[in-house]
């Protein structure tokens, strides 16, 4: 018979034949042959593989480094990685939670809508038209543009969400 060019789900093609993939939590020791099944071995104590695979090495569980403010939220198994979270009152810097911050800052162009608490991180909002923020801050709201008119001045440069307006003297020349 013709050697296969594709294999079923949970199989892989090697040496013109379809071998079974190793199940999650196990790594490949040796490919199948015409006479033997794929040989797999369970991952070690601090290792995992989370898919049907032909990996020869298991992945190391993530280390939740206490020096970065991390602690274990969920211990890893042979089929799942460890999930880290931050110490109480601290917040993850990303979905993967690789490090912790006390709170995040709102970038220029954004103001603080709600200051961080022990439970929730800083909530930022874009500065609307007429307001700006030129700093990175965890407490400052968007500031209103300066009103040139109230100072008997005129707008020389328009404001943006990151910059205030620039006021200047009125043109004294009259037609």
């Amino acid at each position: 018979p013709e050697p296969p060019t594709a294999c079923r789900e949970k199989q892989y093609l090697i040496n013109s034949q379809c071998c079974s993939l190793c199940q999650p939590g196990q790594k490949l020791v040796s490919d199948c042959t015409e006479f033997t099944e794929t040989e797999c071995l369970p991952c070690g104590e601090s290792e995992f593989l989370d898919t049907w695979n032909r990996e020869t090495h298991c992945h190391q569980h993530k280390y939740c480094d206490p020096n970065l403010g991390l602690r274990v939220q969920q211990k890893g198994t042979s089929e799942t990685d460890t999930i880290c979270t931050c110490e109480e009152g601290w917040h993850c810097t990303s979905e993967a939670c690789e490090s912790c911050v006390l709170h995040r800052s709102c970038s220029p162009g954004f103001g603080v809508k709600q200051i961080a608490t022990g439970v929730s991180d800083t909530i930022c909002e874009p500065c609307p038209v007429g307001f700006f923020s030129n700093v990175s801050s965890a407490f400052e709201k968007c500031h209103p543009w300066t009103s040139c008119e109230t100072k008997d001045l005129v707008v020389q440069q328009a404001g943006t969400n990151k910059t205030d307006v620039v006021c200047g003297p009125q043109d004294r020349l009259r037609a």
Partner: nanobody
């Protein structure tokens, strides 16, 4: 490596005053927003006060408004918290924190105990 060292804590009677200091070494406070944060025994972190990088804007938690004053001296690379009219509920370890607020920009804290 940035190190923040808080000092000035101690035992004080209700109604008394203390001035906390936070000195930065290995880096600078200049131009950075800085916070005072406290942790009372058995409680979570509470954000007490903050000062902008320019020193022009400040924030105070409602619980300390009118009693605490935050200030900075960038020439001395030091942050201050003047605490007046102290109450028993101000008892806590006080920490300073500098932008970017990562765990390694975090001091050991100074203990303030308000008790008669």
């Amino acid at each position: 490596e940035v190190q923040l060292l808080e000092s000035g804590g101690g035992l004080v009677q209700p109604g008394g005053s203390l001035r906390l200091s936070c000195a930065a070494s290995g880096s600078t406070f200049a131009g950075y927003e800085v916070w005072w944060v406290r942790q009372a025994p058995g409680k979570g972190l509470e954000r007490v006060s903050a000062i902008s990088g320019s020193g022009g804007s400040t924030y105070y938690a409602d619980s300390v408004k009118g009693r605490f004053t935050i200030s900075r001296d960038d020439s001395k690379n030091t942050l201050y918290l003047q605490m007046n009219s102290l109450r028993a509920e101000d008892t806590a370890v006080y920490y300073c924190a500098r932008d970017p607020y990562s765990f390694d920009y975090w001091g050991q804290g100074t203990l303030v105990t308000v008790s008669s």
